[in-house]
Structure formats: C-alpha cells, structure tokens
Amino acid sequence: AILGRSETQECLFFNANWERDRTNQTGVEPCYGDKDKRRHCFATWKNISGSIEIVKQGCWLDDINCYDRTDCIEKKDSPEVYFCCCEGNMCNEKFSYFPEMEVTQPTSNPVTPKPP
C-alpha cells in the first residue's frame, strides 16, 4: 500500500436495472484491476422532485478525477444524472451533492441511500 492512499478493495454494489441486466440488485462488489491501476468506488443517482433514485453503485477503475477523494461528492451544478467517486473500501455507501457555484449559502445534500 502507498502511504496516504486509501486502497479500494470492495465497494457497495447497486443496480436499479438489475432485472434487465440480470445482476443482483444490491451487495458488495470486489474491485479487480491491473496492479498498476488505482481502484475507486462510485455512485450515480437522480433527483426526481427531491426524491433520490439510485442508478448504480460499484467499483470504478483508475480515474484521476477520483484520486485521494475519501468522500463521494458530486460538484457539478444540477446534472441530469449525478455521479461521484471516491477511494476507500465501501466509500460509496454515502454520497453527497455540493455544487461548485458562486452562491452566498451553498447547500449540502448528504445522502444515505436506502435501496428498495
């Protein structure tokens, strides 16, 4: 292990389309990849009239945008589908939305998903 880096070996798995894709709906996913690649967890979700609908959660492979992020946070302003990634086992259990925009009072929307 490299000092200061959280190695990701497993992530929370969720697939809203589990029936069509013929997968489990939820569980724990082991993260595989080449030895020289970093591994991350991710979450994607939608906000439908204030209700959080998780699309997918799982492992995500070597993405510089995820490096050294211990928390799963979406910073894009009002995307159609939210995405965040992080490093560390099961770091995608919770995810948040902190839009990067110039406002006087930025809002925090932490989410603890409860898959159906």
Partner: antibody, heavy 120, light 107 residues
C-alpha cells in the same frame, strides 16, 4: 503481456452453428468480465454479449438473444460464444475483449478477431 | 437502447493539425463514455475511458472531455500513426452501444 486469441470462425450455411473460443493469457482471467464484439465487413462495431468474472451475469444484444450463448471456463482461461441459427447478417469479424467490471465496461484489451461467414 | 451519434463521419487533416471528434448520446450517460482507435485489418484499441481518462500507453496528445450527453475526443497535434477510425462507446447501460465511427484521413 495480456493476450486474447480467438478461434473457431469459418464458413457456415444459414441455420448452422459455430462455437467461437477466446484463449486468454497474461492476466488473472477469473477476475475480469469478458465480452464479444463484432464488426460486419466495412461496418462499425456492435457489442454482442458480455459475461461477468464468475459467469453469474450474462447479457446479450437483442439481435442475438435466444440464438447465441456466452460462457467461460476459468480453469482453462477461455471464453466461448456458441452461435446457433446463424443468419447472413451474422457475418462479421468477432472480437473478444476484456473489461474490469460488469458495469464500467470499457474494453481495455481486444483479440485479433476471427471471421465468421454465413453463406449458402 | 442508448443511441450514440458521432460527427463528422470522416475528416481530412494534415500532420500537426488539431483534430476534434464529437459524440452525442441520446440520453445522459454521465461519464460512461469510451473512445477507441481502429486501423484497417486490426482490432480496436482503447484510447480514452470514463470520458477523460487516458488509457495505458496512449500518447498525451489524445484527450477526452464532456459529460452528460456531449463528448469530445481531441488530438492536439496529429501524427502519421493517428490516421485511423475512431469510435465512441457508452457503458452507462446494457446493451453497450457504439457510435458509427469517424475516419481520420490524410489531407
């Protein structure tokens, strides 16, 4: 070095069957999802089927559903595609390709391809 | 199924040119977008994955950008070995789908 080597292609009559194989080496085959992608002559790429690392999840394009079956033998480091009820439109080069996870499906290594020709 | 539309379908360029290829998805695919390079008679080769990540062994003149529905592959200074066909591919949902390809030819 990662290597994927397809075999089993050839000329077959409409309605016939073929089984393609993809022999993998240079990586831990049992840790990776695998896919079949085809390319008709002079055309673009079409995903055919995918299977996760332990064979528990399988998925198919609508165009081959019910006719093709993907499988793997992790003890032999080999991926298979059983193709039945072949049609002229199945004529293509078939590639096997590796992906790290079932859902984050970027295909980081590809075989050289094997040509399947369906013709009477 | 998610439809992927690439433009242009072909382009002519000279060595040293900056080349941009675009790919549009029929719905948001977040960052589940990959780019491949294919030369005649050869298998495709991964160039960019997750919209912006450079694949192993790919020169830094290649870059990817975009999220949601609109994505771009840029070659900052075209080299002789870059003349090929480029495909985008979404991995947001199954079935995986590819764009129709962009052929980069020598002017």
């Amino acid at each position: 070095e990662v290597q994927l080597l397809e075999s089993g292609g050839g000329l077959v009559q409409p309605g016939g069957s073929l089984r393609l194989s993809c022999a993998a080496s240079g990586f831990t085959f049992s840790s990776y999802s695998m896919n079949w992608v085809r390319q008709a002559p002079g055309k673009g790429l079409e995903w055919v089927s995918g299977i996760n690392y332990n064979g528990g999840y399988k998925s198919y394009a609508d165009s081959v559903k019910g006719r093709f079956t993907i499988s793997r033998d992790n003890s032999k480091n080999t991926l298979y595609l059983q193709m039945n009820s072949l049609r002229a439109e199945d004529t293509a080069v078939y590639y096997c390709a590796r992906s790290a996870t079932w859902h984050d499906t970027h295909l980081d290594y590809w075989g050289q391809g094997t040509l399947v020709t369906v013709s009477s | 199924d998610i439809q992927m539309t690439q433009s242009p379908s072909s382009l002519s360029a000279s060595v040293g040119d900056r080349v941009t290829i675009t790919c549009r998805a029929s719905q948001s695919i977040v960052r589940y977008l990959n780019w491949y390079q294919q030369k005649p008679g050869k298998a495709p080769k991964l160039v960019i994955y997750a919209a912006t990540s450079l694949a192993s062994g790919v020169p830094s003149r290649f870059s990817g950008s975009g999220s949601g529905t609109d994505f771009t592959l840029t070659i900052s200074s075209l080299q002789p070995e870059d003349f090929a066909t480029y495909y985008c591919q979404q991995s947001y949902e199954l079935p995986l789908t590819f764009g129709g390809g962009t052929k980069v030819e020598i002017k």
